[in-house]
């Protein structure tokens, strides 16, 4: 999906109002310095591309983020403020339902959410280019 035509300010507002708090809740009890950020993003479409991939793609040691509150709110924000996003996600959603039965918080998931926080912070930088 090409995130170029999203309403970035509306997504930013959704992040600031709720998604950021859900990410903090997920990471509660973890020191902010515990994980090194190894990925970043260039402009807002790039940030959303990586946020979407990191949130919804299962990875080694962490296959359970999609049912977390921050993930569901991220998906909703992208569906509302990115034209045509929902249509591209129908097959992905079906696969997600089959793949993820339970929510399990592992250290690898905490590390992944730490990376997500970094990508969202980069998305919100005032000087970051739209595209």
């Amino acid at each position: 999906y090409d995130f170029t035509n999203c309403d970035f300010e509306k997504i930013k507002a959704a992040y600031l109002s709720t998604i950021s708090k859900d990410l903090i809740t997920y990471m509660s009890g973890t020191k902010s310095t515990e994980f090194n950020n190894t990925v970043s993003c260039s402009n807002r479409p790039h940030c959303l591309t990586e946020i979407q991939s990191l949130t919804f793609n299962p990875t080694a040691g962490c296959a359970s983020l999609a049912k977390e509150m921050f993930a569901m709110k991220t998906k909703a924000a992208l569906a509302i403020w990115c034209p045509g996003y929902s249509e591209t996600q129908i097959n992905a959603t079906q696969a997600m339902k089959k793949a993820r039965k339970s929510k399990v918080t592992t250290n690898k998931c905490l590390e992944q959410v730490s990376q997500l926080q970094g990508l969202w912070r980069r998305f919100n930088r005032p000087l970051l280019k739209q595209q």
Partner: antibody, heavy 117, light 108 residues
């Protein structure tokens, strides 16, 4: 200390597919970062080809996107480049590199690929 | 596409002298700029990222400055091992990251 090492044929015929592999040691490619290919034609500057991230996203240089595939084999801790329909203009030293998806902090030594019949 | 232009193409200096290399972007890249050093037959090495942050293990004699469209790499006092080609790279314009054509710093 992460180390990267490119390997593959040094000579490819025009219109064929260039295939290279990058073996990574000292860091798991499924643990973090992105993993990228960059090339440098003889005596010229650098050109970014593309990357994949440790969680599976991929991004390619728009000028090469239609011909490029970057894939990974996590069991061998290596990743590969395929560039189809090559011409003499694809002759270059090809580097693999680790990236934070913005800039490139560790590089392989590079391998020269010549496109010629 | 953002075009990165480096000047001069070649800089002839003696060890101990100060080197000032310029990189100009065709449009603003904010602080999204890196500098690399490349010696003959070797891979590039990251020196500077985010326009002014030194990469791990890079000596303090290397410094970067600038934002927007104009950037400078300064080597305060050239060591023999600093004679090489230097490239700038913008990463503001995903997915079209681009490098400058390089500046060669040679021994006078």
């Amino acid at each position: 200390q992460v180390q990267l090492q490119e390997s593959g044929p040094g000579l490819v015929k025009p219109s064929e597919t260039l295939s290279l592999t990058c073996a990574v040691s000292g860091y798991s490619i499924s643990s973090g970062y992105g993993w990228s290919w960059i090339r440098q034609p003889p005596g010229k500057g650098l050109e970014w080809i593309g990357y994949f991230s440790y969680y599976g996203s991929t991004s390619y240089n728009p000028s090469l996107k239609s011909r490029v595939t970057i894939s990974r084999d996590t069991s061998k801790n290596q990743f590969s480049l395929k560039l189809s329909s090559v011409t003499a203009a694809d002759t270059a030293v090809y580097y693999c590199a680790r990236t934070n998806l913005l800039y490139f902090d560790s590089w392989g030594q590079g391998t020269l690929v010549t496109v010629s019949s | 596409e953002i075009v990165m232009t480096q000047s001069p193409a070649t800089l002839s200096l003696s060890p101990g002298e100060r080197a000032t290399l310029s990189c100009r972007a065709s449009q603003s890249v904010s602080s999204n700029l890196a500098w690399y050093q490349q010696k003959p037959g070797q891979a590039p090495r990251l020196l500077i990222y985010d326009a002014s942050s030194r990469a791990t293990g890079i000596p303090a004699r290397f410094s970067g400055s600038g934002s927007g469209t104009d950037f400078t790499l300064t080597i305060s006092s050239l060591e023999p091992e600093d004679f090489a080609v230097y490239y700038c790279q913008q990463y503001s314009n995903w997915p079209q990251y681009s490098f400058g054509q390089g500046t060669k710093v040679e021994i006078k």
